[in-house]
């Protein structure tokens, strides 16, 4: 609904649409019998400038022509791109109280002529789709600009569609609504885009194409896979395609992978055999199509088919380790441990493990199945024993892994030498060693075994281990390694029927302990004092304790205390000292030392040695 300007008119010269940088003259005229009622000569016409409907300037200084009381002309310059509103108002200057009355407004649009449209690209999606073209319009014109897309082809085929761009919408694509059919495969078509606005017009260069250039097949649909004889590695992929498709591209990958397997299939007719799949693996499959072997475009990828391949029997061998503990003079407890197969070896869900313990000479066999990764049995201490474990899924079992049960640390000559443990960073430890000096049988492999030195760790937690080939003399251990925790690390050298081991403690990161040991008792025996203590609680040790220090001094002395340093042994909780004077009261305390430093002192105890009885 257009409101009529009743009081007067506003006109713009040269036009209400001007190129950037141009000036315009705005004339404001009152209609007859309009104006200030009593004094027509007092009519004053003023012009206000609004941007986004907000007053920005009064143009009283831009008046270039004035017919007093009737009309005024203003010159406006430096207008910015886009639309500016100018409002003419009537100011009856004799009436100070009454504000100026709006007479009429006019919009001036500043813009540019359209650039020739470029980069025209046309597509028809599927054999039954319609031709749609898009283009690059070039610089924004800031004016309403009409675009016409024209197509011409064989047999006087012509077609055109239009759209426009303004400050609310952009026009850079049109669907012509016509379908090109395969029987026009060799024909040439020409499209052109013309742009027109109030400041000029321009045309694109003609763009020529054929049916094959622009038709993009629809992506394949209804994708499915059939696994031959429930095989986990072979399957037939099937899909539906448009009739004219001659070439397909297949891509597939395990879901956690980052690279696709790619296959090209000619004249596949919606079917392709895959032979290199991994069993029991979630896969994603996609297919793309093309209408011509050399020309044309690939379709978009189809929607993904996600499915899991069937199971196959496990492959690979389990990594087995064991612990031996003598129970009494004729019985021992054997604890077997093994690591889970990785998914590519398990090739399915492992349902159970088959465990066998066999005495070689007497042919005694103990068998069991378990769902766990450990198994414990009590067996006689006599005889040569061997263990085997295999993993089973719904399709079968892996080949059993055998290990000879030997006395792991029984042969001193097989003990590795110069074992060291160095912290590499927060979560691993580098263990190095030298081979046994005088082994009377060849080392088949080394096992590096570690466990946290915390109460109950032998019973609560299985060991961690690494198998190392006989020509390697180092291992970087990282599984379950945490900072500020001390680990007992054993390096086992195993031959066919014997074992030797060396032990060391190590940590990946250390701090000084939180507290010192707590002295629980001081007793005197034969001129020697025995200091007894309780070890520092495990969480407060903060790494491997290297040694303890016992400090003492006379009770009121200000002299430096004397000290005795003891190599840390977990099994030791008392130590004698003998250099104290009888009948002198001493204060004693202890500290603990890691590679990072010394703890604060533990509790203080006073003691007065009595010496020899008279």
């Amino acid at each position: 609904n257009i409101d009529v300007c009743k009081l007067g008119t506003v006109t713009v010269q040269p036009a209400p649409v001007i190129p950037l940088g141009s000036a315009a003259n705005i004339s404001c005229s009152l209609n007859p019998k309009q104006g200030c009622s009593h004094y027509p000569s007092s009519n004053e016409l003023i012009l206000l400038k609004f941007v986004n409907d907000v007053l920005v300037e009064n143009l009283h200084g831009k008046k270039v022509h004035d017919h007093t009381g009737h009309s005024s002309t203003f010159q406006v310059t430096n207008l910015s791109l886009g639309m500016t509103l100018f409002v003419c108002k009537l100011n009856c200057s004799n009436s100070q109280k009454k504000p100026p009355v709006p007479v009429c407004g006019v919009e001036i649009s500043v813009g540019v002529a359209p650039e020739p449209p470029q980069n025209i690209s046309c597509v028809q999606e599927g054999e039954n789709g319609t031709v749609a073209c898009s283009w690059n319009s070039g610089k924004v014109t800031y004016l309403k600009t009409n675009y016409t897309l024209q197509l011409s082809g064989p047999n006087n085929l012509t077609c055109q569609k239009q759209c426009f761009s303004d400050n609310r919408q952009n026009c850079n694509r049109l669907d012509l609504g016509i379908n090109l059919s395969p029987d026009l495969a060799e024909s040439r078509f020409i499209v052109r885009v013309t742009a027109i606005n109030d400041l000029g017009n321009s045309s694109s260069l003609p763009h020529t194409f054929t049916f094959l250039d622009i038709v993009i097949p629809l992506p394949p649909w209804d994708i499915r896979i059939n696994f031959l004889n429930a095989s986990g590695s072979r399957g037939t992929l099937q899909w539906e395609d448009e009739g004219q498709v001659v070439l397909n591209q297949l891509r597939y990958q395990p879901l956690n992978s980052t690279s696709w397997n790619m296959v090209n299939a000619t004249n596949a007719k919606g079917k392709y055999d895959l032979r290199d799949l991994r069993p029991f693996t979630e896969y994603e499959f996609q297919i793309s199509s093309k209408l011509h072997l050399s020309g044309g475009s690939w379709s978009n990828w189809s929607e993904s088919l996600r499915t899991r391949t069937p199971e196959e029997e496990p492959v690979g061998i389990l990594d087995i380790w064991y612990m031996k503990q003598d129970i009494d003079y004729d019985r021992q407890q054997i604890s077997l441990f093994w690591k889970s197969l990785n998914p590519s070896e398990a090739r399915g869900k492992i349902l159970h493990y088959q465990v066998t313990l066999q005495e070689v000479t007497k042919k005694t066999t103990l068998q069991n199945t378990t769902r766990h990764t450990s198994w414990t049995r009590v067996i006689p201490r006599t005889g040569a024993w061997t263990a085997s474990v295999s993993a089973a899924n719904s399709k079968g079992a892996s080949a059993p892994t055998h290990i000879n049960i030997v006395d792991l640390c029984g042969t001193g000559l097989l003990a590795p030498h110069q074992v060291s443990a160095k912290s590499e960073n927060m979560d691993n430890i580098l263990v190095t060693w030298q081979p046994p000096k005088k082994a009377d049988s060849a080392v088949r492999e080394y096992i590096v075994e570690w466990r946290a030195l915390q109460p109950g760790s032998i019973t609560k937690f299985p060991p961690h281990w690494l198998r190392i080939p006989p020509d390697n003399m180092s291992a970087l251990i990282s599984e379950n390694i945490k900072p500020y925790i001390c680990y007992e690390i054993r390096v086992h050298a195993l031959s066919e029927s014997q074992g030797g081991c060396s032990s060391i403690r190590g940590d990946s990161k250390h701090k000084a302990p939180v507290s010192g040991p707590h002295i629980t008792a001081i007793t005197e025996k034969k001129e020697r004092l025995f200091i007894s203590w309780t070890h520092i609680p495990f969480p407060e040790q903060r790494g491997c304790i290297l040694h303890y220090r016992i400090y003492w001094k006379e009770r009121d002395s200000t002299a430096q205390p004397e000290l005795c340093e003891i190599q840390y042994r977990r099994s030791q909780n008392s130590h004698p000292i003998s250099s104290l004077q009888p009948r002198v009261t001493y204060v004693l305390w202890m500290t603990a030392v890691t590679a990072a430093g010394e703890s604060p002192q533990g509790n203080e105890r006073e003691f007065c040695p009595q010496g020899k009885a008279n």
């Epitope: 609904n1 257009i2 409101d3 009529v4 300007c5 009743k6 008119t9 506003v10 209400p16 206000l48 609004f50 409907d53 907000v54 007053l55 509103l85 409002v87 009454k98 504000p99 009355v101 709006p102 009429c104 407004g105 006019v106 919009e107």
Partner: nanobody
């Protein structure tokens, strides 16, 4: 001339409500159109709601549609803005604005804004 005085600003939690009020005095024809604008730090002034006397439906910016309601009482010379479901991005100085409804050549009449209140701060914290 026209004088405008806003009130009702303040601080509110995310999801809360506030009601802004603007009292107008002066020439009635110079304030056919009354509306609310806002300006957040470092941003351009934004027109958010307008009510005119031409019987047209109120205008609302997309950012406030469905949450803010403008109401005008010509007898009392006031225009109010009820703000519900406030968000931290609504934090700004809110201005009441007024001006005439102007007939424009070859198009519909337009509200233009020549008179402004001093602004009231609205802060929405999360």
């Amino acid at each position: 001339q026209v004088q405008l005085q806003e009130s009702g600003g303040g601080s509110v939690q995310d999801g809360g409500s506030l009601r802004l009020s603007c009292a107008a005095s002066g020439d009635i024809y110079a304030r056919n159109c009354m509306g609310w604008f806002r300006q957040a730090p470092g941003k351009e002034r934004e027109k958010i709601a307008v009510a005119d006397t031409g019987g047209r439906s109120p205008y609302y910016a997309d950012s406030v549609k469905g949450r803010f309601t403008i109401s005008r009482d010509n007898a009392k010379n006031t225009v109010d803005l009820q703000m519900n479901s406030l968000k931290p991005e609504d934090t700004a100085v809110y201005y009441c604005a007024a001006g005439p409804l102007v007939p424009v050549v070859n198009t519909a009449a337009r509200c233009v804004y020549e008179y402004w209140g001093q602004g009231t701060q609205v802060t929405v914290s999360s």
